[in-house]
Every structure is written in C-alpha cells, then in structure tokens.
C-alpha cells in the first residue's frame, strides 16, 4: 500500500489512475467504507464523510482516466487509509498527517527554552530531526527541547519528520528576543557628552514594554535607578529620571541615552533591563563607563581613570612625540616636575588606544592650560 505523508493545514492530492483514458465511474472511500466522493456520469458526487467540505477532485482530468482526491486544510484526524475504486480495482493509499508546533510563542527571550511538539496520528512512530539556523542538529520523538536559547538560534528551524522511509519537512521561524550586545563599554574624557545605545537584535511589528537603567557608580556604595521608561509601539517615553545625572532619552528605537557630561562620580557600570509585554523575564544589557581626567597641580602632572577597567589595560603619560615617561597597569599615573609641552594621557589595550586626554604644561612661571 502506498504511503503519503501530509502536513497539518496543507493540501494533499492522492492519485488514482484507470487504464482506460476516459471518464469512467470511480469512488474514493475511507477505511470505514464511507464514501468521500465519486462521480455520476460527469457529475461530482460527495458522500457523508467528515471531509465533505474539504475534499474535491480534478474534474478536468477525468476524461484522461485520472481521478484524484484532493484534501484541503489537512487535519491530524484525516490520517487514514483511502481507497479508490475504479474498473473493479482498488487502489489503497495510507495518508499520515503530522503537525509540528512551538511550545508557546515563537518569540522567546534569550536564555529561555524552546520546545517543539510533534502531533502525529495514532499508531505512527515517527522520528524528528531539527536543524537550527546555526547548524546545530537535535533529534527526538514527540517533543524536542532546546534550553538556553542564544541569539544565533534566531531564524528558520528546519525539522524533518521520518515515517515509513518517507519524510515531511516543517519550517518554523523562531525569534530570539535580545539586545545585539550583552555588554558594551564607553570610554570618555571628563566633561565630554556620553552616548549609550542599546540596539535590539530583532524587529517586530509592535513592541511594547517598560525598562529601567540601574547604575552602580564605582565611588558609590549602592546602585541607583537612573531612569525608567515605557515603550509603546516602538515609541519611547520617560517615566522617571534622576536629577543627578539628568539623562536624556531618544523617543524612537534603538534605545538611546545621553549623559550630558562624563564625570568621575558617574564612572561605573549599569544594567538596562527591558520587560516586554506578554513575556515572562527581561532583556538585559550591561553598559560600562570609563572616565579619564588629566590634571596638573603644582609640580605634579596626574592622569586618572575611573570605572571598570580590565587589569591588562595600560595607563601612560607621555610628552608628545616622545617615549612614555610613565606607563603602568594602574588607574592613576603621575609625573613630578613635568617638562613644558603638550602631554598625552593614554589608556590602551595591547597597543590600541582606547582613550586619550591632552594637557598643556607651561613653563614653571605660568599656570597649566587644558586644551
């Protein structure tokens, strides 16, 4: 008996061919011998089956001895053996209909689990193999689970159901809701304007939720909420903002925050959380601010950085176009009795300059000038 696999919601055409290339009498029945459809001369007739409004034929091919059964909007319960009776012969076709659905929503937060559930007809023993957009293969039976979804899991998952050495393929689009970057770091000279950006790694028609930026300043004993905001259909509105610092926030996505001035007391790290409507859990992005200050007090030229720097970062003081006078893996360096000229304070990582501040040292009879 011929086996045909179908997909829930799809259409299937079961073929039935007579040896005579002309329109003759035919009937399609199910395993309970209930008539689905057939012909009476050149007329299509339908029986009392549950397929009544979803089953049809291809009238135009009857004259050529072809009498297909076309079933629209397949259901799991359409799985059955279908019998075509034509010319005193019986052609049997076993139809097995499968469905594959994601557990809840196909929009999941980073770190959440994805469960795919296979709907299959009684008596079938299918195997399922799914391939993620990043090429990871998972196998299973009636359910497949992937824990700790990552950003790279966003995209089309292709799942193949195997039964009776035949296969049917499902494609499921999964969107992992996350920020593009888990963490970012901004390096600024004291007094400069600071821009924080929090681009999302997904696009959806309507985006609604609320968010907050908590900030842990390096100099402070506890963290505090700098700003809270609402997101409605991709429009951002500020709910509450601290007086110091007075952050400004962009009205459109991507989420964008502006700190008017980088000051040592603001250096530290923040955590922006975004709670999306109808989702359990929150999106997170860490943001760090490193602030540099170069000063000259009497005979001491000092360069300092505040904020979360890695121990491998190098802080240097050098006179322009000369070798570094001092270079240390520390957060403050200084030079006593500096020569007159333009001094540079550099924060670098493996030779790459991350932050630079210049200070002009005047001959000893004058006061220093910061350009």
């Amino acid at each position: 008996k011929k086996v045909v696999l179908g997909k829930k919601g799809d259409t299937v055409e079961l073929t039935c061919t007579a040896s005579q290339k002309k329109s003759i009498q035919f009937h399609w029945k199910n395993s309970n011998q209930i008539k689905i459809l057939g012909n009476q001369g050149s007329f299509l007739t339908k029986g009392p089956s549950k397929l009544n409004d979803r089953a049809d034929s291809r009238r135009s091919l009857w004259d050529q001895g072809n009498f297909p059964l076309i079933i629209k909007n397949l259901k799991i319960e359409d799985s059955d053996t279908y019998i075509c009776e034509v010319e005193d012969q019986k052609e049997e076709v076993q139809l097995l209909v499968f469905g594959l659905t994601a557990n809840s929503d196909t929009h999941l937060l980073q770190g959440q689990s994805l469960t795919l559930t296979l709907e299959s007809p009684p008596g079938s023993s299918p195997s399922v193999q799914c391939r993620s957009p990043r090429g990871k293969n998972i196998q299973g039976g009636k359910t497949l689970s992937v824990s700790q979804l990552e950003l790279q899991d966003s995209g089309t998952w292709t799942c193949t159901v195997l039964q009776n050495q035949k296969k049917v393929e499902f494609k499921i689009d999964i969107v992992v809701l996350a920020f593009q970057k888990a963490s970012s770091i901004v390096y600024k000279k004291e007094g400069e304007q600071v821009e924080f950006s929090f681009p999302l790694a997904f696009t959806v028609e309507k985006l609604t939720g609320s968010g907050e930026l908590w900030w842990q300043a390096e100099r402070a004993s506890s963290s505090k909420s700098w700003i809270t905001f609402d997101l409605k259909n991709k429009e951002v509105s500020v709910k509450r903002v601290t007086q110091d610092p007075k952050l400004q926030m962009g009205k459109k996505l991507p989420l964008h925050l502006t700190l008017p001035q980088a000051l040592p007391q603001y250096a530290g790290s923040g955590n922006l959380t975004l709670a999306l409507e109808a989702k359990t859990g929150k999106l997170h992005q860490e943001v760090n601010l490193v602030v540099m200050r170069a000063t000259q007090l009497q005979k001491n030229l000092t360069c300092e950085v505040w904020g979360p720097t890695s121990p491998k970062l190098m802080l240097s003081l050098k006179l322009e176009n000369k070798e570094a006078k001092v270079s240390k893996r520390e957060k403050a360096v200084w030079v006593l009795n500096p020569e007159a000229g333009m001094w540079q304070c550099l924060l670098s990582d493996s030779g790459q300059v991350l932050l630079e501040s210049n200070i002009k040292v005047l001959p000893t009879w004058s006061t220093p000038v910061q350009p």
């Epitope: 799809d10 055409e13 073929t15 049809d56």
Partner: antibody, heavy 118, light 107 residues
C-alpha cells in the same frame, strides 16, 4: 504557505529549446500537482499543461503537444518545463503554479521571461 | 476547447464604486470556474474558486456567483489596491482555459 521560485530570464534563438525550473518550498512537494501557464507581452494567460504529484502523469494542452515536456525531481523539490522548437511567438513570461484542481491555482512562481529572437 | 469570454474588456471606476465583471463559457462548466487578479509585472493571484468560494486571505468585498455558462465577479467597494486585470478560468475539462481579462483602471 508554499513558495515557488523560478529560474532566471532566458534569451533563445528560433529552433532552440528552453528549460525553465520551478523550485518549491514550504509545502510537501510530492503532495500537489504543478501547472504551467504562460503570458505573452500585453496578452492574457494561457495554460500549457500539468504534472501530477508523483510525476508519473502529465497532461498537455493540444497546442503544445510534442513540443513541451514537464518533469519533476522529488529530491530537489523542483519541477521543469522544457519547450523545444522555439519560435518568436513563444516569447512570454512562463509561470509555474501549484494546482489544486477545482480549488484553483493558489500559489504562483514569480515568472520567467523567455525571449525568442534571432 | 471551451472558450471563455469576459466583459467588459476594460472599465474605469472610482474608489468606493461597486464593480461587476462577467465571464461566459462556450458550453456548460457547471461551477468549475475560478477568478484571478493580476497586477503589472506580478504573478496572478487566486481570488475565488468553484464560482463562489472565497480564497483564504482574500478581502470579503470580492464575491463570485453563477453556474453553467454565466458567471460574475463583484467588488462591492473598490479599493485603491484593486486596480488590476481580472481573469476567469474554467477547470471543467482539459485544456484549462482563461478568459481574455478585464482591466480595471482609475476613472
């Protein structure tokens, strides 16, 4: 929903043959028939023929009998339509479409322009 | 072969108008008739199958009626996106045949 993606435009000389492909995705390829329909510039639609789900049976319009061959490759979910002995009046956009019989042609390819010119 | 004719071959209408296109078969095709919409440079789109059944996703302002040899496609309130060419098609017998089309443009 089923997507049908056709091969690119072709320019052929009179007397030559052209083979247009139609790759299906999103549905179960071996479960539905494919019809081919063409449309000459500024003209209406003209049905060329049909290939059944198993690929075992084809039916062609009398006008194209002997010149057209429709085949399907289940391993790549692709249907092919080859038209031979081309003449200038075969210049047209050729469409493949999922044929659900009396339910109509519900999904169409984007079309392939075949230009026959000496 | 069954010949399909359509009338009018073209018509001008305004947004909000009720538009009726007729299709006639040279012999009875019972209810084996489909309607398609085609926009310039695009593939046709199925609107109505078996004379009066609305294809999934097609706006309810489209409706079809008729059986035997005479059929009608009605757009109850023409929308800007409805300006296109409309074709009828019979699936009663091989060869499948289409009507010559009715072009609906802006008045």
């Amino acid at each position: 929903q089923v997507q049908l993606v056709q091969s690119g435009a072709e320019v052929k000389k009179p007397g030559a043959s052209v083979k247009v492909s139609c790759k299906a995705s999103g549905g179960t390829f071996s479960n539905y028939a494919i019809s081919w329909v063409r449309q000459a510039p500024g003209q209406g639609l003209e049905w060329m023929g049909i290939i059944d789900p198993s690929g075992g049976s084809t039916s062609y319009a009398q006008k194209f009998q002997g010149r057209v061959t429709m085949t399907r490759d289940t391993s790549t979910s692709t249907v092919y339509m080859e038209l031979s002995s081309l003449r200038s009046e075969d210049t047209a956009v050729y469409y493949c479409a999922r044929d659900l019989g009396d339910y109509g042609l519900d999904s169409w390819g984007q079309g392939t322009l075949v230009t026959v010119s000496s | 072969d069954i010949q399909m004719t359509q009338s009018p071959s073209s018509l001008s209408a305004s947004v909000g108008d009720r538009v009726t296109i007729t299709c006639r078969a040279s012999q009875t095709i019972r209810s084996y008739l489909n309607w398609y919409q085609q926009k310039p440079g695009k593939a046709p789109k199925l609107l109505i199958y078996k004379a009066s059944s609305l294809e999934s996703g097609v706006p309810s302002r489209f409706s079809g009626s008729g059986s035997g040899t005479d059929f009608t496609l009605t757009i109850s309130s023409l929308q800007p996106e409805d300006f296109a060419t409309y074709y009828c098609q019979q699936t009663y017998t091989i060869p499948i045949t289409f009507g010559p089309g009715t072009k609906v443009d802006i008045k």
